[in-house]
Each structure stands twice: as C-alpha cells, then as structure tokens.
C-alpha cells in the first residue's frame, strides 16, 4: 500500500513514522508547555561531543518570564517520517512547533538534502496565537511530484540566535519504470548473433522487461530487469525496443534500428582538384558506407590513349580525407580515373570513370650529341645537337636554351641564347680569343626548361691559328672534353 499525503486544509495528522513511537526521542522536556503534548524534548549535549557544541533541535531560552520561571526548550513536534507516493501526484506535509509569545520574528525555512528550498515551492506558514504560546505550522506542498523531489526534508527555525531543526520527512517518489540502459542502434553482420541490453528501475520494484521486434513481442514471459536479448542473427534491417513494466504501469524505450552490414556504394563526384605534369590531385565523395566504416580506398588509373596497352595502375590509400595525389604520371597525357572503397564486408564497385590530363612539363632529358666547332673565317662557334626523344620532351618543344661560358685569364662570362624549335644547330659569335668556351644546351617547352646537356668545351686561340676540328659531347666517362688544337 502507498501512503499519499494529499493537500487538505487541516494540518497533517501526527504520524509516528514507520515504526510507531520510534521517532520520539529518549530525552524528556525540562518543562512542559500548554498544548505541547507532542513536544520533542531538549537535546542534552554530551560533554564528549567533538568540535563545537552541536546546535541541535532545541533552543534553551535564557529569558525568564515575569514570575522568573525559566522558559522551556523549544522543539518541533513529531510528524510523518516517511511518505511514499506516485510520480505526478500531489503531496503536503508539515512541521509544527509551539513558541512562547515572548519571541518575535520567528521564521521557518524548508531544506531538502542539506539545501535550502527557495523560490518556486509552495511553503506556507500559519500562526495560531494563544495566551502564552503561538502554535506555528509550516506546510510544504508539491502539486505534481517528480523523481527529483525524492529526498529528506527538514524544517529549520531561527530563534534567539539558535537554530531549531526538525526530524526529517523522507519523501520517496514511485513511478513508472525509468530506463538506466536502453538498447542501442547497431550495425551487424548478416546471420551473426548479437546482444541488446535493457535495464529499468523503479521504485517500485521489480521491473519486468518485454522485448519487441518490428512491433511484435519477442518473449512471451517477462524477464526481470536488467534483460539481455540474444538475437541469433538477421537477414534484413529490424527495429527493436523494450517495454519496462512495474506496478505503476509501462514505459517503452526508444526504438533502435539494427542494420545489416553490406558492401559500400561506389564513390561519387570524383573530381580533379589540381593537375601538374606528373601528378593529378583528385577528390571524391564517398558513397553509402554499408553500415560499416570505410577502411581504405583504391584509385585506378589507366591511359586514355587508344594505342596504350590498357594496363591499369592501382594506388591504395586511407579512406580519409577523400583526397589523393596520383604521382609518377606522364606529362601531357590523358588518363581515365576511377575510385573504389572498401569496408569490412568488401569493395564497392568503381565510381564512374572520369577523364583527366596532365599538363606540359619541362623536358626530362637534355638534347643529345652536342658538338661544337670553331668557324674562324666567320669568327663564329657552330653548335649542333639532336633533339631529345619525343617521349621525354614532356610537352611540345618551343625551342632551346644555349649557355656559353667564356673563360680567359681569370675572367669568366656566361651568355644565354634562345633558339627556335625547328633547328638543331646554332651559331654564336666568338666573344673572347685565347679563351675556353664551354657550351651546354637545354630543351624548352611551355612547361619550362629541361636539364642542360653535359658541358662541351672548345679552346678559341688567338688570331692566326688554323685547322679547327670539332669538339663534341663526351662519351660516358670523359668528364671534361677539351679540344686542343
């Protein structure tokens, strides 16, 4: 049975607590007052009590009346000790005390679990004066109790610089089951067993659990909370919830979706973020993960040139950050690119293929077979070379850059010449006689200047010398070719 104290005009009937008489203390009052049959008596301080004297339930007034009789100790009367009530019901309880009229300005405050109750609470104090004493009844009401109203309530009265404290009123709120653990959404492997947990508490206990799958009860007999449901395996998505029942009624948990893990959908929106001569930066939007986190992705690259051998380059990368720089590509080439990602179940299909091109690059090799000879009659140096292989030009040849350095008696001077792409020879004027001329040539595309060829040196004698043989790019192993005439 549940005692529910309801609001009513008359004060709450005196209730000796769950154990009749047990809330009456063992001490007896020093002096009885009229209307004080329910008095709580004086608290006699123990000389062995540690710390400061305990300001307890009782104030012992020092004031004496006209007849010089000492005034009695003050204490709250006993009231209900324990109230159990249902959530959302109303409750009213009170403290009462009789105070000699000699005292003025007495105030009663309500406290719950050590904290003063201020503001939005219904606390009413009524005064019933008599010839010698005033009966004070402090009522506290809650119109719709919540679980948070659970607690130990006491009254405090300040009087004569003393604090009088009542015995506690324990308020225990019972209600529908309250979930402490609800089932959680899960992603599971097809046909693999898994567990769901549901736990709810009262009061009142016990709490019984029924499991529900797709709106149908799973267990015919209730299980005591906490309950673990073992599902042997699913082949398709399902929604589970649990019902918690106690004497007050039923609470239903949130419904949770149990998904079946599958291979991911292919990535979408593969796009080119940046292209260089030898790399392409791509990004993609991952497809649906199939209820299982992506582990990694694979970028597939094939040459779009119909004459290519159709081989596919594969680059593996982490699933994040949906960005990858494909390297080691040829310049000025067309590629088809697709992306596929995997989770624990397997690989997705490949995304729609996109076409991408690398840009022109600077040539990767220098012109070949560079030869240099002196044409004294015209006072020129003739230079000849072979253009680099087309594959290694990395773009459309726009010309050549010739570096010629003249060194004589500690003086060194470098000059640069630009030559159009059509020729494979050039003529430069002799700058200094009795000097060494060192020649290097680089191929040029719109992508930049390629590497310079190995240096070829030719000695330019003073005027009047004859017979000039050519100097040429050295065979491997000859580090510093010089034509001596």
């Amino acid at each position: 049975a549940i005692t529910e104290a309801r609001e009513e005009a008359k004060p709450y009937p005196l209730f000796p607590g769950p154990f009749p008489g047990s809330l009456q203390t063992d001490h007896t009052p020093l002096l009885s007052l009229p209307h004080a049959s329910g008095y709580q008596p004086a608290l006699m301080f123990s000389p062995t009590q540690p710390g400061r004297p305990h300001t307890g339930n009782v104030a012992i007034p020092q004031v004496t009346s006209v007849e010089s009789k000492p005034l009695p100790p003050l204490a709250f009367k006993h009231t209900v000790g324990h109230i159990i009530l249902s959530e959302h019901k109303g409750v009213k309880f009170n403290c009462s005390i009789s105070v000699p009229n000699i005292y003025q300005d007495t105030t009663i405050s309500w406290w719950k679990d050590g904290k003063e109750l201020l503001g939005a609470h219904h606390a009413i104090t009524q005064f019933y004066p008599d010839d010698e004493v005033t009966a004070i009844i402090a009522s506290f009401s809650i119109t719709s109790v919540q679980r948070s109203d659970n607690g130990s309530y006491i009254c405090k009265m300040k009087i004569n610089n003393e604090e009088i404290v009542s015995d506690p009123i324990y308020i225990e709120v019972q209600g529908l089951p309250h979930f402490t653990k609800q089932p959680e959404s899960m992603n599971v492997t097809r046909n693999t067993a898994f567990n769901l947990t549901c736990q709810a508490v009262g009061p009142p206990e016990p709490v019984n659990i029924f499991w529900v799958q797709n709106s149908s009860r799973v267990n015919e007999q209730p299980e005591k909370s906490p309950s673990v449901l073992t599902v042997p395996g699913l082949t398709e998505m399902a929604v589970f919830s649990c019902e918690a029942h106690n004497d007050k009624g039923l609470t239903v948990s949130k419904g949770v979706q149990i998904n079946i893990k599958a291979i991911p959908s292919p990535p979408t929106e593969v796009s080119i973020r940046n292209s260089t001569a030898h790399s392409i930066l791509i990004s993609w939007v991952p497809g649906f993960d199939g209820y299982s986190p992506f582990r990694n992705c694979s970028i597939q690259v094939k040459e779009a040139d119909p004459l290519s051998n159709g081989s596919v380059m594969i680059f593996n990368t982490s699933a994040l950050p949906h960005l990858y720089q494909i390297k080691q590509l040829q310049a000025l080439a067309n590629y088809s690119i697709g992306v596929s990602c995997m989770n624990e179940i397997g690989w997705s299909a490949v995304s729609p293929w996109i076409l991408a091109s690398t840009t022109e690059g600077a040539p990767s090799v220098a012109p070949l077979n560079v030869t240099v000879f002196l044409n004294e009659s015209s006072d020129n140096v003739d230079i000849r070379w072979m253009k680099p292989p087309t594959k290694q030009q990395d773009g459309e040849l726009v010309g050549y850059r010739i570096s010629h350095v003249w060194q004589s008696a500690g003086i060194s001077k470098e000059l640069l010449e630009e030559v159009g792409q059509n020729g494979s020879r050039a003529r430069i004027s002799v700058q200094v006689h009795n000097a060494t001329c060192t020649v290097r040539i680089a191929a040029v595309t719109r992508g930049g200047v390629g590497p310079f060829s190995d240096p070829v040196k030719i000695f330019i004698p003073a005027h009047g010398w004859v017979d000039y043989a050519p100097s040429s790019t050295p065979a491997p192993g000859n580090a510093d070719p010089v034509l001596i005439i």
Epitope: A1, I2, T3, F15, P16, P18, F19, P20, G21, S22, T25, D26, H27, Q40, L43, F45, H54, G56, N57, V58, V80, G81, H82, I83, I84, W111, K112, D113, G114, K115, N150, G151, S152, I154, I164, V165, S166, D167, P168, Y170, I171, E172, P203, E205, P206
Partner: antibody, heavy 118, light 112 residues
C-alpha cells in the same frame, strides 16, 4: 557515492570506555539518520540505536541505554558512539549504517572491532 | 519487541539450485502508513551486511534478479532462483516497523 568510513580496531581494558567514529561522505550528512549495530563473533546482529545528525536527536534500544552514547559532529560529517564500563560482553564488531530514503539501512560502514581484555 | 524467527539456520545447496529462507515476526510488520518495513541483507564472510531486498519485495539497486522477496503481515520469504558461489554467506531479515529494530538470527547458505 555514499560511503561510511569507520575508525580502526580497539583493544581496551574492562571498565574503560571507547569512542568509535563513522565518517560519512557522498550525501548530506545532516539529512539522514545514522544507526549503530552490534555483532558479536559468530552471532547475529543487534540494533543499538539511531542519531539524527541534523538536530542531535537520538533513540536507543533499551538494552544499550547507559552503555552507548550517540553523538554527531556536523562540521566533519562524523557520527560517534561511546561505549562505557566495558566488559567482555561488549567485545564485538560495531557497524554504523545510514537509514536511506527507502527506510532501510542501505549503506554500512566496514565495521570497527572492539576487544575488551585485561 | 518484535521477535524475528528465521529458518533454517543453515541451508546447504548445490550451485544452480533454488534456495528459500523464511522470516516470521511475532507481530505484524505493517506500519500505520500501510507499508511493511521488512528488509533482507546478505553478509559475506569478513564483510559488512549488504542490502538485498527492501520493504518485502523491492530489489535494491545493483542486486541481481536471482533474488526476490515476498510475504505480508508476519510471514516473509527470500528466494534465490539459481544459487551461485558469490551468493554464499549469512542472510538476515530486519524489521524497522517497531522499535527496537530487530534482526533475524541469520541463515547460513553453504555448499552441499
């Protein structure tokens, strides 16, 4: 979380007194009754009495009146029980326990062993 | 005083068995507020008592559903549906309806 920490074991002489402590934490000490219980070796449990620390009110089992004195110090959230005129019959483990909202002794101290021996 | 008579004094069981302990009061434990303040405790060797069931049939927080209580007035029962090794110890009933509070004499649950 609610905890009650009791003082260590005591070895006392017959006729002497002993005071054991019970320090509370994890809840409002002045809002809940503290009860004391005696357990002699290999025997059952006997209720000694309660104190309400909020106002110092006490209630004793008649069998322990004059034997046990219950006090509380709110500044340190500690309840005390003094046992006087000790005899071998008082050799026991003494427990403090909180009377919770459900009106049951829901949390207990670890116990204090008192041995009375000359 | 309300005298609490607990039976049996000793209860040998096999693990997995059901166990039942009885507690009988010399007077009704129903309080004037309609509640019955009869509680069950387990004391494991070398430990303090721990609350299992409060007010006849309510499991205290953290107590497993193997434990259940029933009864009214003067007769009360604690049942353990499937005894496990960790359940061994002494079980006490306690009434707090009447002062002085009184305990049952205890039932020692032990392995057969």
């Amino acid at each position: 979380q609610v905890q009650l920490q009791q003082s260590g074991p005591e070895l006392v002489k017959p006729g002497a007194s002993v005071k054991i402590s019970c320090k509370a934490s994890g809840y409002s000490f002045t809002s809940y009754y503290i009860h004391w219980v005696k357990q002699r070796p290999g025997q059952g449990l006997e209720w000694i009495g309660w104190i309400f620390p909020g106002n110092g009110n006490t209630k004793y089992n008649e069998n322990f009146r004059g034997k046990a004195t219950l006090t509380a110090d709110t500044s340190s959230s500690t309840a005390y029980m003094q046992l006087s005129s000790l005899t071998s019959e008082d050799s026991a483990v003494y427990y403090c326990a909180r009377l919770g909202l459900i009106y049951a002794l829901d949390y207990w101290g670890q116990g204090t062993s008192v041995t009375v021996s000359s | 005083d309300a005298v609490m008579t607990q039976t049996p004094l000793s209860l040998p069981v096999s693990l997995g068995d059901q166990a039942s302990i009885s507690c009988r009061s010399s007077q009704s434990l129903e309080s004037s507020n309609g509640n019955t303040y009869l509680h069950w405790y387990l004391q494991k060797p070398g430990q303090s008592p721990q609350l299992l069931i409060y007010r006849v049939s309510n499991r205290f927080s953290g107590v497993l559903d193997r434990f259940s209580g029933s009864g009214s007035g003067t007769d009360f029962t604690l049942q353990i549906s499937r005894v496990e090794a960790e359940d061994l110890g002494v079980y006490f009933c306690l009434q707090v309806t009447h002062v002085p509070f009184t305990f049952g004499s205890g039932t020692k649950l032990e392995i057969k």
